[in-house]
């Protein structure tokens, strides 16, 4: 989103006696930030602290196991995606504090705000990959025994990253800095100018590929997985269900406001009242989406506590237990406790 419109009302008729002192805010916005911006700043601060520390810890735990444990490969890649996005937060935070002034230049404008979209696509594609892995473990255990290896997992992750980069390119290309004449301010945002159709196309593709299609496919995928695990009376299936639902739900819940406002704005005139209202909420929607970047480590810890009873172990060992247990593939009849547990621990991805 981030198109170039933050609203102030238009007052009355031309009045030459209405000249103001240049030191006073002339567009009827005070020097205090709007409530949505303040909330966004609070969320950004929390996400940065939890996201950087949490994902760094996850990377540290999984990096050592990634050579031999496929689950570790999944969680390592997810954590890297989240960690990278968190690195942009101090800049985005600073910009909001300065009333959306962007003093960081054109390259930073193209790259940094695009990181959250890269994260969205990378996360959902990695989650789809993980879900396919879960599905195959349940329904094609013999195939998994023969072909499911670390090499294939890394290839799948590389494909997911490649596709994510490709899908982020349109937003990256249309990001520009614009310097407003009065009040003097440099803004960073997307500018499609003449091409409203292209703006709509980008928004629709983002909604479909980054939200609706994954929502549909992952819902179907996990419905089948859970029905199978229940029918086999697999142990801990309710715990599995809870974790899977929590993980899937977190992605879609936190991206929902961003996706809805984005699609609405692409179909509205930039000067319409609804558009201007949605623009006020833009930073808040972005910050809400950013919660995805810190939620996974929290889910891992909560899941780990669930499996271990009380939190008796250290955080790294707890995470190691959750993230690096390898799924044991047996005959499909004996869909093992280990597989079910691993799913619970985070099929998590979604």
């Amino acid at each position: 989103m981030d198109s170039f419109n933050y609203t102030t009302p238009d007052y009355g008729h031309y009045d030459d006696k209405d000249t103001l002192d240049l030191n006073t805010p002339v567009d009827k916005t005070s020097n205090t930030l709007r409530v949505p911006d303040i909330l966004a700043l609070v969320i950004f601060a929390v996400v940065f602290l939890v996201g950087v520390l949490g994902n760094a810890l996850v990377v540290w735990v999984t990096a050592f196991e990634a050579k031999r444990t496929i689950n570790a490969i999944w969680f390592l890649n997810l954590a890297v995606a989240d960690f990278l996005s968190c690195l942009a937060l101090p800049i985005l935070f600073t910009s909001i504090v300065q009333h959306h002034h962007w003093p960081f230049g054109g390259a930073a404008c193209s790259i940094l705000p695009s990181l959250i979209l890269l994260n969205m696509y990378a996360s959902i594609l990695l989650l789809a990959t993980i879900s396919a892995d879960r599905f195959l473990l349940v329904f094609k255990p013999i195939w998994c025994q023969n072909f499911r290896g670390a090499g294939l997992a890394w290839i799948a992750c590389a494909v997911a990253w490649g596709l994510a980069l490709l899908l982020t390119i349109p937003s990256f290309l249309y990001r520009v800095v614009r310097e407003e004449y009065f009040p003097p301010k440099v803004l960073c945002g997307v500018d499609y100018s003449h091409d409203k159709r292209r703006e709509r196309a980008v928004a629709i593709v983002r909604l479909v590929l980054g939200f609706l299609w994954p929502l549909l496919t992952l819902t179907i995928c996990y419905t089948f997985i859970l029905l199978r695990t229940w029918s086999r009376r697999a142990t801990r299936s309710t715990k599995t269900l809870k974790v899977v639902v929590a993980v899937v739900a977190s992605f879609f819940i936190f991206w929902l406001p961003y996706q809805v406002t984005g699609i609405m704005m692409s179909f509205l005139e930039p000067s319409s009242p609804t558009f201007l209202l949605l623009k006020k909420l833009d930073s808040l929607c972005v910050s809400f989406a950013y919660i995805n970047c810190c939620i996974n480590p929290i889910i891992y810890v909560v899941a780990g506590q669930g499996f271990q009873g009380r939190l008796r172990k250290s955080l790294p060992s707890l995470l190691r237990n959750v993230l690096t247990e390898e799924s044991v593939v047996r005959e499909s009849k004996s869909f093992t406790r280990s597989t079910v547990d691993t799913m619970a621990q985070k099929t998590q991805a979604v």
Epitope: F4, N5, D21, D27, D191, Y192
Partner: antibody, heavy 121, light 112 residues
Framework: QVQLQQSGPELVKPGASVKISCKAS????????MNWVKQRPGKGLEWIGR????????RYSGKFKGKATLTADKSSSTAYMQVTSLTSEDSAIYFC??????????????WGQGTTVTVSS | DVVMTQTPLSLPVSLGDQASISCRSS???????????LHWYLQKPGQSPKLLIY???NRFSGVPDRFSGSGSGTDFTLKISRVEAEDLGVYFC?????????FGGGTKLEIK
Amino acid sequence: QVQLQQSGPELVKPGASVKISCKASGYSFSSSWMNWVKQRPGKGLEWIGRISPGDGDTRYSGKFKGKATLTADKSSSTAYMQVTSLTSEDSAIYFCVRFLITSTRYVMDYWGQGTTVTVSS
Amino acid sequence: DVVMTQTPLSLPVSLGDQASISCRSSQSLVHSNGNTYLHWYLQKPGQSPKLLIYKVSNRFSGVPDRFSGSGSGTDFTLKISRVEAEDLGVYFCSQSTLVPPTFGGGTKLEIK
């Protein structure tokens, strides 16, 4: 009413400098920006830069950085533009233009009558 | 810089006719406060430009109601409903949304 009275025409030699004045009346000089615009036949209108008389803050178009210098004297409500190292390319009509700043609108509303600068040896 | 493209370059009209001048910008002129700072000026021979329309569609004080402005985003139009002799001259569109403020190349309104 708002008036911007510019200094008279100038005939100057290449390499020399010229300083044009613009006396404002009929409004609070410090509360609006003063812009300078260049007009050459067949070249349209070009924004040179602006000065905020209240604090002396200036902003120039990239093309005129180092070429034009804007100043303002609050006591006499007069804005000045000095153009240096003149060439035939600088032969033009130069306008001072008030940029009105109010709670309702930002617009270049009143223009001076223009100062013709001719660069010739 | 924002490029302002005016069409036509020259507009021959008969007195009493309607005239329409188009102005297109290379970037959106919607300001971050939601307003669009697109203005129209008329410059008569030997005079300085005079403001006619500010912020797309607002007539400046003393401007007759036969002048009207419209448009949004990047496409704008100035209409003169019934051209009078005093309307002849060069019309410029201008934007003051972005740095630097820029002007269209001008449209010369002349008698057919």
